[in-house]
């Protein structure tokens, strides 16, 4: 049994960090091999993670940590029964994926605009609360070709648009991504979408 | 506001034994990791122990590892230091403090004003 | 363990002087550097966080620069009231860990 790409690692910066890697052939990720995880300091609990398949021969696992903080920096095992497959260390603050947003909203009682509001996936207490910028994708869902990305650089999690730039009477949907700029993180995954009917009409005079 | 409150301080003879409290208010204490640093007379500042908010993970400075134990009670919003085995090295003023942000517990905005351990026969 | 060396260990300036502080880790921490200040029989108070980022209510006077090894906090027009112990610390890594203290004096 031998590893044909290497676990890497990303870490929600809270409390679960994902690990991916693949095998050389089919794997019974489950059943054939486990993940150790240990903080490096002193001597630390070591935790087990029961892979799951990702794909034929891809395999996940997800590590729940004690609150991750800064300071802490992990030893990973891969074995697959008595062998060990791979060792290897993980920094979680060092390899941030923001968690997705949540609750996306569509709001269309102003008749001329358009506003989005979604959740921050963060609570107050953690740094990335105040570090998180967005990127809203907008697409017709009739004409894939007429999709948008905005991004919302400021902290508040809204988006205003006119509704006079989107196609009248056609149905759209909206998700949203996050990252943190001080962390230089990778984006989280998108929201998932939710669908609005654009039903502004322009007033007669500018038809 | 955030305040954090020592008690137990006091003098004690070497091989002794003495349990620092630290009452906190004004934040949610079980999201927090919370740390005791001390400081020895005339000397700088030196990490004690840190223990994390929800499971509980406990990190000691060397120096204390196996004589000293941090704890956490949520429900009463109280950090405790039990000191075992104390020698004459351990005296200092003992602060607790709590971190700016829940991810990031070096940073520490918020102190105690300290409760003075003297271990001396 | 990292350790983190501060110089000086004392210094005296005048009123208004532009005061540098510096801190160097044994190893490289990137930003994870936090500046103290401790007044006599104060505890200590946080000044600057991640390096460079000025904690809530601290005066614009202080400013902290530096990442992996080398660090600097400045203080660009010294106030009387800037009479401390300043000392900093990484939480990089476990365990965290200070430097041995700069003592400001005013002359």
């Known amino acids: 049994m031998k590893v044909l790409q290497e676990p890497t690692c990303v870490s929600d910066y809270m409390s679960i960090s994902t690990c991916e890697w693949k095998m050389g052939g089919p794997t019974n990720c489950s059943a054939e091999l486990r993940l150790l995880y240990q903080l490096v300091f002193q001597s630390s609990e070591t935790h087990t993670c029961v892979p799951e398949n990702n794909g034929g021969v891809g395999c996940v696992c997800h590590l729940l940590m004690d609150d991750v903080v800064s300071m802490d920096n992990y030893t990973l095992d891969l074995w697959a029964g008595q062998q060990l497959l791979w060792k290897g260390s993980f920094k979680p603050s060092e390899h941030v994926k923001p968690r997705a947003p949540g609750n996306l909203t569509v709001h269309t009682n102003v008749s001329d605009t358009v506003l989005l509001t979604w959740s921050n996936p963060y609570p107050p207490d953690n740094y990335l609360y105040n570090d998180l910028t967005y990127a809203v994708n907008i697409w017709n869902e009739n004409d894939l070709a007429d999709s948008r990305i905005h991004n919302v650089t400021y902290l508040k999690p809204t988006l205003r648009i006119p509704a006079s730039t989107l196609k009248s009477g056609i149905s759209y949907r909206a998700r949203v991504r996050a990252w943190a700029q001080h962390y230089n993180t990778t984006w989280s995954e998108w929201s998932p979408s939710t669908k609005w009917y654009n039903s502004y009409r322009e007033p007669f005079e500018q038809r | 506001q955030v305040q954090l409150q020592e008690s137990g301080g006091g003098l004690v003879q070497p091989g002794g034994s003495l349990r620092l409290s630290c009452a906190a208010s004004?934040?949610?204490?079980?999201?927090?990791?919370l740390t005791w640093v001390r400081q020895a007379p005339g000397k700088g500042l030196e990490w004690v122990s840190t223990?994390?908010?929800?499971?509980?993970?406990?990190l000691y400075a060397d120096s204390v590892k196996d004589r000293f134990t941090i704890s956490r009670d949520n429900a009463k919003n109280t950090l405790y230091l039990l000191m075992n085995s104390l020698k004459p090295e351990d005296t200092a003023v003992y602060y607790c403090?709590?971190?700016?942000?829940?991810?990031?517990?070096?940073?520490?905005?918020?102190w105690g004003q300290g409760t003075t351990v003297t271990v001396s026969s | 363990d990292i350790q983190m060396t501060q110089s000086p260990s004392s210094l005296s300036a005048s009123l208004g002087d532009r005061v540098t502080i510096t801190c160097q880790a044994s190893?490289?921490?990137?930003?994870?550097l936090a500046w103290y200040q401790q007044k006599p029989g104060q505890a200590p108070k946080l000044l600057i966080y991640?390096?460079?980022r000025l904690q809530t209510g601290v005066p614009s006077r202080f400013s902290g620069s530096g990442s992996g090894t080398s660090f600097t906090l400045t203080i660009s027009g010294l106030e009387t009231e800037d009479l401390a112990t300043y000392y900093c610390l990484q939480d990089y890594s476990w365990p965290l860990t200070f430097g041995q203290g700069t003592k400001l004096e005013i002359k």
């Open positions: 991640g390096g460079s």
């Open positions: 403090a709590k971190p700016l942000y829940s991810n990031l517990a070096g940073d520490l905005g918020s």
């Open positions: 190893q490289s921490i990137s930003s994870y």
């Open positions: 004004g934040f949610t204490f079980s999201s927090y990791s």
């Open positions: 223990i994390k908010a929800r499971g509980g993970t406990t």
